[in-house]
Interface confidence: low
């Protein structure tokens, strides 16, 4: 429905509050260099603009497209050419030509300093002496960090950040109190943030179709008793959702956000008997909830699938009639079905059927050509089956920094071109899954470990994509959105890496790892493990071992040293050469 | 905005025929889901068929089905419900429902329709 204000509209939606948080996050993504001060600036700004419109929505511009208004301001910026380089250049196009420009140029890397948490008491008094300035800082900082954080998520972030200040800053131990609700708000959003990178991923770069076939799995694993129809309505909705939000809609986005959510708690008797709690919720509470929702029951007289899409006379006409709404039922009927699989392996099925029915549609007789379809699912179940039990059997007898050391040497061996950061970062990550899925029952294991590893391969292809460094990653990461994970496993050591040249610089190490907490004590390690496979992509599970054992015995050794910078130095040259005679460098 | 018209109810006798029509203005019908749904006097409405949108995959209640058959005619912007081996237990108030935004798929479910038609009564009596 057409407004004659679209920005009175969204202002009128979703309250003044709401409204200045988005426009926040939406700048802060796309301008991810500017202070906090000239964003805060801007804001005001459309803000100002806005209220106009409402008391008046014919004045002069208030006509105009959110992307045109946005854009305008985000171009009034003076040292954009400086700061930004090309992408001022944006601002020479039309829309929608300079939103989709700005959007190119979102960096999921940002040359940013890495944010340093004040002692607690520094925090409190800048919490209680400008609560907003705070609270809008916090967005700021992320939003730049995460260029595709969802925005009505992190809307909901800053609301629980604000809650445990207001709790902490007047307990007995403040920090007791703050500084784990800190970590899990952190390790959230990290988590969150990976999550929708892959919506927007699947989105922008395998298209509409790839997303909504995401979600009726997803979705009819959530709420097997819904019929097709409502699982539909309801993948229409939230790809449109996350297409706005991918897109840097973030006022339609949230807007629909909660259209959404209001949809599915006035129509929770269609959907899953899960929700109830959820829609007693405020807003954002209640959307974040939805989101994370459990499965509901499966009904308990399902049929056998096999009877309308193997056994039917009419599975070619039907086929032929609406492909997409024909596998779309398949998926559903599926994925309702098996709440054990992870999302990519029912997406894999389900294009395994659809190739066959391409083709056997086609043959002379198709039931006799399609009739044992579901025996080729058997090898595409067990692949995910067997790799989890055989890495979690690991992830138990290793425990997490040995297996996140196992997987940066696997890793490293298999694309030995990427960053080190990136391969520490990536790997350290692909290493949660142990602690994140092991623990799962069978039933629970796949859906864990399969569907989470599909968001940390994502992080390596977005990181990869800003500067591709290897053909065997840009593959992977291009090929096919529901075999990533399959094609990286299927990597063998790269024969074709001439080893990096050795470098002592690389394998010196000072004091100041002994104050280093002891994940970023782990990352050193890991990082020195990565350079090593590099110098050394040949060397075997026990050099690596014997050559990692020194080195962490070193690093003890000086640490508890009078002198440690000079036990770091000397220590340090005998290390670097048992290690290169340990490796045969 | 989706406009509904409904027409060609009346009284028949069991065993008969009637079809019904749907007018449509607004919104091409061959871009919407729509349906048909009845409602017998003190009971709630209920699903009757329906035609997805964009394609024309059919769906209908067991009640009906073999007897009950739902077309439409885009180039009239309009659907039909073609009612024939009438039974008493037809008699209700016809509606014709609409739900835009392309879904390939109807629903049995009256609240997934934002438009609804007026209603066009039938009597199926001896």
């Known amino acids: 429905d057409a407004h004659k204000s679209e920005v009175a509209h969204r202002f009128k939606d979703l309250g003044e509050e709401n409204f200045k948080a988005l426009v926040l996050i939406a700048f802060a993504q796309y301008l991810q260099q500017c202070p906090f001060e000239d964003h805060v600036k801007l804001v005001n700004e459309v803000t100002e603009f806005a209220k106009t419109c409402v008391a008046d929505e014919s004045a002069e511009n208030c006509d105009k497209s959110l992307h045109t208004l946005f854009g305008d301001k985000l171009c009034t910026v003076a040292t954009l050419r400086e700061t930004y380089g090309e992408m001022a250049d944006c601002c020479a196009k039309q829309e929608p030509e300079r939103n989709e420009c700005f959007l190119q140029h979102k960096d999921d890397n940002p040359n940013l300093p890495r944010l340093v948490r004040p002692e607690v008491d520094v925090m409190c008094t800048a919490f209680h002496d400008n609560e907003e300035t705070f609270l809008k800082k916090y967005l700021y900082e992320i939003a730049r960090r995460h260029p595709y954080f969802y925005a009505p998520e992190l809307l909901f972030f800053a609301k629980r950040y604000k809650a445990a200040f207001t709790e902490c800053c007047q307990a007995a131990d403040k920090a007791a109190c703050l500084l784990p609700k800190l970590d899990e708000l952190r390790d959230e959003g990290k988590a969150s943030s990976a999550k929708q990178r892959l919506k927007c991923a699947s989105l922008q770069k395998f298209g509409e179709r790839a997303f909504k076939a995401w979600a009726v799995a997803r979705l009819s694993q959530r709420f097997p008793k819904a019929e097709f129809a409502e699982v539909s309505k309801l993948v229409t909705d939230l790809t449109k959702v996350h297409t706005e939000c991918c897109h840097g809609d973030l006022l339609e986005c949230a807007d629909d956000r909660a259209d959404l959510a209001k949809y599915i708690c006035e129509n929770q008797d269609s959907i899953s008997s899960k929700l109830k709690e959820c829609c007693e919720k405020p807003l954002l509470e209640k959307s974040h909830c939805i989101a994370e929702v459990e499965n509901d029951e499966m009904p308990a007289d399902l049929p056998s699938l096999a009877a309308d899409f193997v056994e039917s006379k009419d599975v070619c006409k039907n086929y032929a009639e609406a492909k997409d709404v024909f596998l779309g039922m398949f998926l559903y009927e599926y994925a309702r079905r098996h709440p054990d699989y992870s999302v990519v392996l029912l997406l894999r099925l389900a294009k395994t059927y659809e190739t066959t029915l391409e083709k056997c549609c086609a043959a002379a007789d198709p039931h006799e050509c399609y009739a044992k379809v579901f025996d080729e699912f058997k090898p595409l179940v067990e692949e995910p089956q067997n790799l989890i039990k055989q890495n979690c059997e690991l992830f138990e007898q290793l425990g997490e920094y040995k297996f996140q050391n196992a997987l940066l040497v696997r890793y490293t061996k298999k694309v030995p071109q990427v960053s080190t950061p990136t391969l520490v970062e990536v790997s350290r990550n692909l290493g949660k899954v142990g602690s994140k899925c092991c623990k799962h029952p069978e039933a629970k294991r796949m859906p864990c470990a399969e569907d989470y590893l599909s968001v940390v391969l994502n992080q390596l292809c977005v990181l990869h994509e800003k500067t591709p460094v290897s053909d065997r990653v840009t593959k992977c990461c291009t090929e096919s959105l529901v075999n990533r994970r399959p094609c990286f496993s299927a990597l063998e050591v790269d024969e074709t890496y001439v080893p990096k040249e050795f470098n002592a610089e690389t394998f010196t190490f000072h004091a100041d790892i002994c104050t280093l907490s002891e994940k970023e004590r782990q990352i050193k390690k890991q990082t020195a493990l990565v350079e090593l496979v590099k110098h050394k992509p040949k060397a075997t599970k026990e050099q690596l071992k014997a050559v990692m054992d020194d080195f962490a015995a070193f690093v003890e050794k000086c640490c508890k040293a009078d002198d440690k910078e000079t036990c770091f130095a000397e220590e340090g040259k005998k290390l670097v050469a048992a290690s290169q005679a340990a490796l045969g460098l | 905005e989706v406009q509904l018209l409904e027409s060609g109810g009346g009284l028949v006798q069991p065993g008969g025929s009637l079809r019904l029509s749907c007018a449509a203005s607004g919104r091409y019908i061959d871009e919407t889901a729509v349906a048909w749904f009845r409602q017998a006097p003190g009971k709630g409405r209920e699903f009757v068929a329906g035609i997805g949108g964009g394609v024309d995959i059919t769906y209908y209640a067991d009640s009906v089905k073999g007897r009950f058959t739902i077309s439409r005619d885009n180039s009239k912007n309009t659907l039909y419900l073609q009612m024939n081996s009438l039974r008493p237990e037809d008699t209700a108030v016809y509606y014709c429902?609409?739900?835009?935004?392309?879904?390939?798929?109807?629903?049995?479910?009256?609240?997934?329709?934002?438009?609804w038609g007026q209603g066009t009564l039938v009597t199926v009596s001896s």
């Open positions: 429902a609409a739900r835009p935004g392309r879904p390939l798929i109807t629903s049995k479910v009256a609240s997934l329709y934002p438009y």
